[in-house]
């Protein structure tokens, strides 16, 4: 049967993808085959075969990013690392071992699902611009985070959420492959309003908040607080 | 019930060639999905890895048979072959195909292959 596990990276750091026979086990390396490739798209991510030190059939993507070491797999521990993760990497990764002495059965196969995540910058809050009498509107962007952000608009009298309807999220995949997001938000006049952009990533379980105030145009900044309804001091930043 | 069935074996001359074919029948199981392997096994030896594919489709081969042997497979026909070149006395064996890793319950009975010098 298969085994499965999941781990977490961030961008840009590496990871060991966990494929290991229990301790105390020997493995001759004239002996084993050990495959390591994609689960969907079956992409080749290394191998190891009998007196065979090519690696001609590794997709370019994981050339010389991901290694097995020979002295963990005479111990039995086929467990990949992978250097430099990137976005891409997010998917399932499935570990194969078999054994020429046992007639090419399979002794170990291991699915990996690798989570990758980057933190999201701090927000910035534009200062509030009025394109008619009685509308206002804010601006909040963050950049270079993974996954996927959600966004939230916190009336920051109350600490109470504003409606979802009067904001429109764009969220752009950048060249890096990580999520740009610009939140437009756009609520009626009045005399002082003071709000926060939240920007919460949800696998970090991490959320960034920034405020931003009107009446007497003073603009708060950089505050980052632990969720959409919690509060803080001023110009505190704080990573939750 | 999965059935691997292989033909194609026979006695050949040092040199010659031969194309082996495994049929793939049984519930709904396809050989462009599933990563195949050509093992044989001569008398007193344990069974070897002859050609790997896998179903990403990378392909790999038994050093001693690299640039001789080729593996290939028909999608629509559900079919894996191996085409044998330049075969000398060493290859003479049973030929299985099989999944990889190998399944006994999978497993047919294999054709020979001699090669005579």
């Known amino acids: 049967d298969t085994q499965e596990k999941e781990v977490r990276a961030m961008v840009g750091s590496d990871v060991e993808l966990s494929c290991a026979c229990p301790e105390g086990s020997r493995f001759d390396l004239n002996d084993v085959y050990v495959y390591w490739q994609t689960s969907e798209s079956k992409t080749v991510v290394t191998y190891h075969i009998p007196q065979n030190s090519s690696l001609e059939n590794v997709d370019s993507r994981y050339r010389n990013r991901a290694l097995m070491s020979p002295a963990g797999m005479l111990r039995g521990d086929f467990s990949l690392r992978l250097f430099n993760v990137t976005p891409q990497d997010e998917q399932k990764f499935h570990c194969l071992v078999l054994s020429q002495s046992l007639g090419f059965q399979e002794v170990l196969s291991v699915e990996v699902t690798l989570h990758v995540a980057a933190n999201f910058s701090v927000p910035v809050v534009s200062a509030p611009h009025s394109p008619s009498q009685d509308e206002l509107t804010f601006t909040c962007t963050s950049i270079n985070g993974y996954p996927r952000p959600n966004v939230y608009w916190i009336n920051k009298t109350d600490n109470s959420l504003l409606d979802q309807a009067l904001q429109n999220d764009t969220v752009f995949l950048n060249m890096r492959g990580l999520y740009d997001v610009v939140s437009v938000l756009r609520i009626a006049r009045t005399p002082s309003v003071n709000i926060g952009c939240c920007i919460e990533n949800v696998l970090l379980q991490q959320n960034l908040t920034v405020g931003s105030q009107t009446g007497n145009d003073i603009g708060e900044r950089d505050k980052i607080t632990e969720n959409p309804v919690s509060t803080g001091e001023k110009n505190a930043a704080t990573w939750s | 019930e999965v059935q691997l069935v292989e033909s194609g074996g026979g006695l050949v001359q040092a040199g010659g060639s031969l194309r082996l074919s495994c049929a793939l029948s049984g519930r709904a199981v396809s050989i462009a999905a599933t990563a195949m392997g050509w093992y044989r096994q001569a008398p007193g030896k344990q069974r070897e890895l002859v050609a790997a594919?896998?179903?990403?489709?990378?392909?790999q081969y038994l050093d001693s048979v690299k640039g001789r042997f080729t593996i290939s497979r028909d999608n629509a026909k559900n079919t894996v072959y191996l085409q044998m070149n330049s075969l000398t006395p060493e290859d003479t064996a049973v030929y299985y195909c099989n999944t990889l890793p190998w399944r006994a319950n999978y497993s047919g009975q294999g054709t020979q292959v001699t090669v005579s010098s």
């Open positions: 594919r896998w179903s990403g489709g990378s392909i």
